[in-house]
Every structure is written in C-alpha cells, then in structure tokens.
Interface confidence: low
C-alpha cells in the first residue's frame, strides 16, 4: 500500500495505525495516500518539524496515549486537508504559538488529558473552521479574554476537569454557534452575569462539580435552546425566582448535591419538555403547592436525601406524566391522602427511610399503574384496609424494617402478603416488632393463635374478617423469601454496606434507570 512502515498496519481504506512501545519517533515512510493516521500507545516524546510533510491528503490524525511532551511549531505543516486532530492523553504542558497554523480545514481538535497550564488567544486564532475543541483534563487555571474569539463556528467546547477558579463574562461572547459547553469539575465559585448571553444556540451546559454558591437571576435568560443543564454538586443554597424562566427547551436539569433549602412555587418553568429533575442531596424541608406545576412532561422527580418533613397536598399538581417519584431518606411523618392523586401515570414511588407512622387509606387511590412501592425503614405499625387492592400491576413492595404491630389487626395485611407473595416476589419479608411474644418473627408467618387481640383504638379502619387457611399447601414457602424470585440484588437487600461500597447510584437513590449528572 504505497509503502507501510513495519511498525504500522495499513488498510486499503488509506488508514494507517502505528502502535506499540517500541515506536519512539513518527514512523517513515508513511503512505502518501494515507487519509487517516493513528499513533497510539507509543513512546514518542516529541514531534519535530514536518514529520507528516508527504501525507498532505491526511484528514484525520490521532496521536494519543503517548509520552508526547514537546511539539515543534511546524509539526503539522502541509496538512491543509486535516479535519480531525487529537493529541489527547499525552504529557503536553505547553502548546507552541502557531502550532495549528495552516490547518484551514480543521474541525475537531482534541487536547484533553494533558498537562496544559495555559492557553492564549494566539493558539487558536487560525482555526476559524473549528467545530469541536476538547480541553478537559488539563491544568488550566484561567481562560484569557479572546482565547476563543476566532472560533465563531465552534459547536462543542469542553473545559471540564481543569482548575478554573473564575470565568470572564466575555470569554464566550463570540461563540454564537456553540451547542455544548462543559465546565464541570473545576473550582468555579460564581459565574458572572452575562457569561452565557452570547450562546444563543447552546443546547448543553455542564457546570456540575464546581463550588458555585449563587446563580445570577438572568444567567440563562439568553439560552432559549438549552436542553440539558447540569448544576449538580455545587454549593447553591437558593434559586433566584426567575433563574429558569427562559428555558422552554430544557429536558434535563440536575441540581442534586447542593444546599437548597426551599423551592418556591413556579421556580421551575415553564419547561414543557423537562423529563427529569434531580434534586437529591439538598436541604429541602418542605414542598409547597404547585412547586412543579409547570413541568407537564416530567417523568422522573428525585427528591431523596433531603430533610422534607412536610408536603403540601397540591405539591405535585400538574405532574400527570410522572413515572418515578423518589422521596426516600427524608423526614416525612405524615402524608395527606390526596398528595399523589394527580399522579395518574406513576409507576415507582420510593418512600423508604422516612418516619412515616401511618398511611391514609386513599394514598394510592388514583395511582392505578403503580409497579413498585418502597416503604421499608419507616415507623409503620399497620396499613389501612385495601390500600393495595386496586394496584393490579404492583410487582415490588418493600415493607421490611418497620415496627409492625402483629396483633389481630395485622392479619388482613398478613393474609394479603401471603396471597400476593408470588406476584410481588418480595426479597425481604416484614418482621413483627410488637407485641413482645412475636417480636422478630416474619409477619407473613405469624401464627393466628399467637397474635394477640388488639387493645388499642385503631388508627386505621378495622378489617372485615378475611378467610385464612393456614394449612393450605398451595401457599408459597412462607418461611423463605419468595421462591418465585431469586435474590439477584443482594447488595441492596441485605449486604452490610460497610463491607462493600456500591457504586451504582441507583441502588442508593432507589431508582430504576441509570442516570448521571
């Protein structure tokens, strides 16, 4: 194929790949018709003058995962057709001025995962056709004004995983075509008003894992096309009332891992396209009426790991499309019977790790499609008659780690669990807490003769007599976890979490889909 270096492989499609630790310099001679060249995992430490001079047809050049620490300014001379250049995962600390001069066709420039300490306006001044610039994973502490002024066609800019402590409000002002801006994992403490005003086509803005404490009220007012906004793991303590008012296209918003104490009605919206809202790991204490009412298409709402002790009956008004609601690990003691009434499409509700003492009998009355209810680790002593009877799709119900009061009032619930155990496939059966003579016994195998009569005024309606046939062999093995479902998620169900740390967030948040900020 027009001469292929022995250290490389060359394909008929004019693709050349040179890999291996034995390579210490750019192999020669390279095929003159090469259109794609990859130099990967070598011990090349520097690029000298014009090593690619004879392959002027080159379109893509990947020099990745090498020991590259020095590049001569003329290294890429004569590559006027080059569209894609990656120098990622090397050891570059400095970029020579003029390095990219003459690369008039360059559209993608990847400089990520190096050790770059600074960039200057002159570095990219010749790259007028650049569409993608990846600078994440370097050691940049600031971006000088004008650094990107000539990159008017840029659509994707990644500055994540650097050491940026502040951003000039002018640094992005000429990037009117930018669609993706990533500034995650830096040290930003605030973003000046106007910083994003010029980004009228921005679709994704990633600001997660910084130290942002305050959001300017109009910070996103010019970003009408924004679809994904990541603000998680910052220090945001309050949201200005109008901060999200001009984001009609937003479909993903992450605010988890902040210090939010309250959410005012109307703070979110109108956002007719928002599908997911992530608010876990904040300090929210209550939810007022209509706080989410503008989010008509919301499907996932994660409010777990806050300090919520009160939910107003109309807090979830408008969420008619909601599929998943996570309220676990809060301070809830009571719920209004109508609080979930509007959630006609809800499939999964996580209420575990609260202080719920009782549930209203109508709590799930209009939520006929529920498939999973997590109620473990609350203060429940009993449940109202028929609370689950209409939930024909219910296939996961977790009731363990509650102080169940196993007197005669518990028998209907016990019978319901027995009759529905194969369908539910519960992993861990609920255990009686009182009276003392049955403490520690599994609720579903309480002997009808042992359970003592109720001596208290019931907090829930008393049950009609439920037929029960203790010796019926067709019941599942009631001494065991349901035999219809193998225990395939043991970590979540009973592993001592000091022994093994689960990294899948879903097992922590009680969710059903893999998501991240």
């Amino acid at each position: 194929y027009h001469g292929c270096p022995s250290e490389c492989t060359c394909s008929r499609a004019s693709q050349v790949e040179c890999t291996g630790a034995r390579i210490v310099a750019v192999p020669t001679p390279l095929p003159w018709n090469a259109m794609s060249l990859q130099i990967l995992n070598t011990h090349i430490t520097e690029l000298n003058e014009s090593p690619f001079l004879n392959i002027s047809a080159l379109i893509a050049l990947r020099i990745e995962k090498n020991e590259l620490s020095r590049i001569t300014p003329g290294a890429f001379r004569n590559l006027g057709s080059l569209r894609y250049l990656s120098l990622a995962n090397n050891k570059l600390q400095v970029l020579p001025i003029g390095l990219f001069q003459g690369l008039d066709s360059l559209e993608s420039l990847l400089l990520s995962s190096n050790q770059l300490l600074q960039i200057q306006p002159a570095h990219f001044s010749q790259c007028s056709n650049l569409k993608e610039l990846q600078l994440h994973g370097n050691h940049l502490e600031y971006i000088p004004d004008g650094a990107f002024d000539h990159l008017v066609g840029l659509t994707k800019l990644n500055l994540g995983k650097n050491s940026l402590t502040h951003i000039s409000p002018r640094v992005f002002q000429h990037l009117g075509n930018l669609q993706v801006l990533r500034l995650y994992e830096n040290r930003l403490t605030d973003i000046p008003m106007g910083t994003f005003d010029g980004l009228v086509n921005l679709q994704e803005l990633a600001l997660q894992q910084n130290q942002i404490g305050l959001l300017s009220p109009g910070l996103f007012h010019n970003n009408h096309n924004l679809q994904r906004l990541y603000l998680s793991n910052n220090h945001i303590s309050q949201l200005p009332p109008s901060v999200f008012m001009q984001l009609p296209q937003l479909n993903r918003l992450t605010l988890f891992g902040n210090s939010l104490k309250e959410l005012s009605p109307g703070i979110f919206g109108p956002m007719p396209n928002l599908r997911e809202l992530w608010l876990y790991d904040n300090h929210i204490s209550s939810l007022p009426d209509n706080v989410f009412s503008n989010l008509r298409q919301l499907q996932v709402l994660i409010l777990s790991r806050n300090q919520i002790s009160f939910i107003s009956p109309g807090a979830f008004n408008g969420l008619t499309e909601l599929r998943e609601l996570s309220l676990h690990t809060n301070a809830l003691q009571d719920l209004d019977g109508n609080v979930f009434r509007m959630l006609a499409n809800l499939q999964n509700i996580s209420l575990q790790n609260n202080r719920l003492r009782q549930l209203p009998g109508n709590i799930f009355a209009n939520v006929n499609g529920l498939m999973a209810i997590q109620l473990q680790n609350n203060q429940l002593e009993n449940l109202p008659l028929g609370i689950f009877d209409h939930l024909g799709k219910l296939c996961e119900l977790r009731l363990y780690d509650n102080p169940w009061r196993c007197d005669s009032d518990i028998l209907p619930l016990r019978n319901w669990l027995l009759l529905n155990q194969p369908r539910l496939g519960t992993d861990t059966v609920p255990v009686c807490f009182s009276p003392a003579n049955v403490r520690g016994q599994s609720l579903i195998i309480i002997n009808v003769n042992v359970a003592v009569p109720s001596v208290h005024v019931p907090e829930v309606p008393s049950y009609p007599e439920t037929p029960w046939y203790p010796d019926t062999p067709s019941y599942p093995d009631t001494t065991s976890v349901s035999s219809t479902t193998e225990l395939t998620s043991p970590v979540e169900d009973y592993t001592d979490l000091t022994t093994i740390q689960v990294t899948d967030d879903r097992s922590v948040w009680g969710m059903t889909q893999a998501q991240s900020g």
Epitope: T428, S480, E486, P490, V491, D496, I500, V502, D504
Partner: antibody, heavy 113, light 111 residues
Framework: EVQLQQSGPELVKPGASVKMSCKAS????????IHWVKQMPGQGLEWIAY??????KYNEKFRGRATLTSDKSSSTAYMELNSLTSEDSAVYYC????????WGQGTTLTVSS | DIVMTQSPDSLAVSLGERATINCRAS??????????MNWYQQKPGQPPKLLIY???NQGSGVPDRFSGSGSGTDFTLTISSLQAEDVAVYYC?????????FGGGTKVEIK
C-alpha cells in the same frame, strides 16, 4: 471480637433429626445474614441456606430437610436436619454476612446405626 | 445453578514463588458493576477463611500477598510469594445468586 460458636459433635441414627446451633457474639446479630454450609469428609463446600431477620432462602437440594431458625435474644442461629442418612455425615459450618467473612468452628455430624 | 470450575486441582509451588489459581463460572457473576466472586482458604481441621471478596477486595487481616482479579466468568487468585503457612485448600465461590456455589477446591503444597 466477632465469634461464631457452634454446638458440639452429634452421633445420630438414620431417620432421626438433629438440631445444631451457632451462637454469635461481638457484633449486632440482627444486622447480618447467617449461612449454613456442608462439607463432607475430604470433599468441598456446599451452601445449604441462609437466615436473615427470620427470612430464609434454601438451596433446593436441602429444602424440606433443612430448617433454619434463630433466637435473637441469645444471638443464636439454628439448623435442624431431619430424615438423616449416611450422606448427611459431614461437618456443618455457620458463616456470617454476604461474604462469609467469619465462620464457626464447625459441627461434626455422624449418622450411623 | 451457576457451576464453578476451579483449576488446577492441585498445585505445588516453591517457597517464595508465585501461585495462581483460576476459577471459571458457567455464567457471569457480575451485577451492579460488581463481580460477586469470593475466595476462601481452608487449612486441615479448620473452617474456611475469607481471603478475597467481590473479586479483588482483601478480607480483614489478609496478607498483601493474596490478590484477586477478573470479572464476568473468569477469575484468578494469586499468591505473589508463597509462604509455608499458605499450604491449604483454596475455594472460589459465587454469591451473585442462590444457590451460592463453590468451586471444587485447589490444594496448594510446597514443592
């Protein structure tokens, strides 16, 4: 110090039943699973069942012949084996937690007429 | 049931040398991004002792010369420098799903 102390050796006749115990100390008994494992002389290890908060899960091979129970007040787990045959002669171990991080010293069961 | 196959059945290694034991599961034992594979050491007349849990995590008090690796269906226990007190039978075990199953064991001796 975490310890699992098992009951002493048993010599029983075929067809009889036996109940062995595993007393836990040094940790919160209710926070961990207790497993039971069988090891025949010169052979490998075979998982029988576990018990946790009165929920049990059995190896189908032992279902119906092994019964696990526990006494939280004394931090003791029990395994009863019935309809014994010579094939049940083995050392039976209890072990703690999902990763079997602590084991009892074993109870030797000999089934012989 | 998941079948665990250990190899070799026995292994004779000189003191100070590396010992490697392999274990293959009949299906993946990965879940939640974790490999539910554990390794145990059993000396004559003693109960088994946990060496490695979740494929590569050392049990409490286990010397650094013991390490585990692998994912999916193929796993390895390595003793980097065999000591006299390491003479024992070693078992792998999957704890992904019931019934939890053990390998047949590998007897390690001094050459």
């Amino acid at each position: 110090e975490v310890q699992l102390q098992q009951s002493g050796p048993e010599l029983v006749k075929p067809g009889a039943s036996v109940k062995m115990s595993c007393k836990a100390s040094g940790y919160t008994f209710t926070s961990f699973v207790i497993h039971w494992v069988k090891q025949m002389p010169g052979q490998g290890l075979e998982w029988i069942a576990y018990i946790y908060n009165d929920g049990t899960k059995y190896n189908e091979k032992f279902r119906g012949r092994a019964t696990l129970t526990s006494d939280k007040s004394s931090s003791t787990a029990y395994m009863e084996l019935n309809s014994l045959t010579s094939e049940d002669s083995a050392v039976y171990y209890c072990a703690r937690d999902f990763y079997f991080d602590y084991w009892g010293q074993g109870t030797t069961l000999t089934v012989s007429s | 049931d998941i079948v665990m196959t250990q190899s070799p059945d026995s292994l004779a290694v000189s003191l100070g040398e590396r010992a490697t034991i392999n274990c293959r599961a009949s299906e993946s034992v990965d879940y939640y991004g974790i490999s539910f594979m554990n390794w145990y050491q059993q000396k004559p007349g003693q109960p088994p002792k946990l060496l490695i849990y979740a494929a590569s995590n050392q049990g409490s008090g286990v010397p650094d010369r013991f390490s585990g690796s692998g994912s999916g269906t193929d796993f390895t226990l390595t003793i980097s420098s065999l000591q006299a007190e390491d003479v024992a039978v070693y078992y792998c075990q999957q704890s992904k799903e019931v019934p939890y199953t053990f390998g047949g064991g590998t007897k390690v001796e001094i050459k």
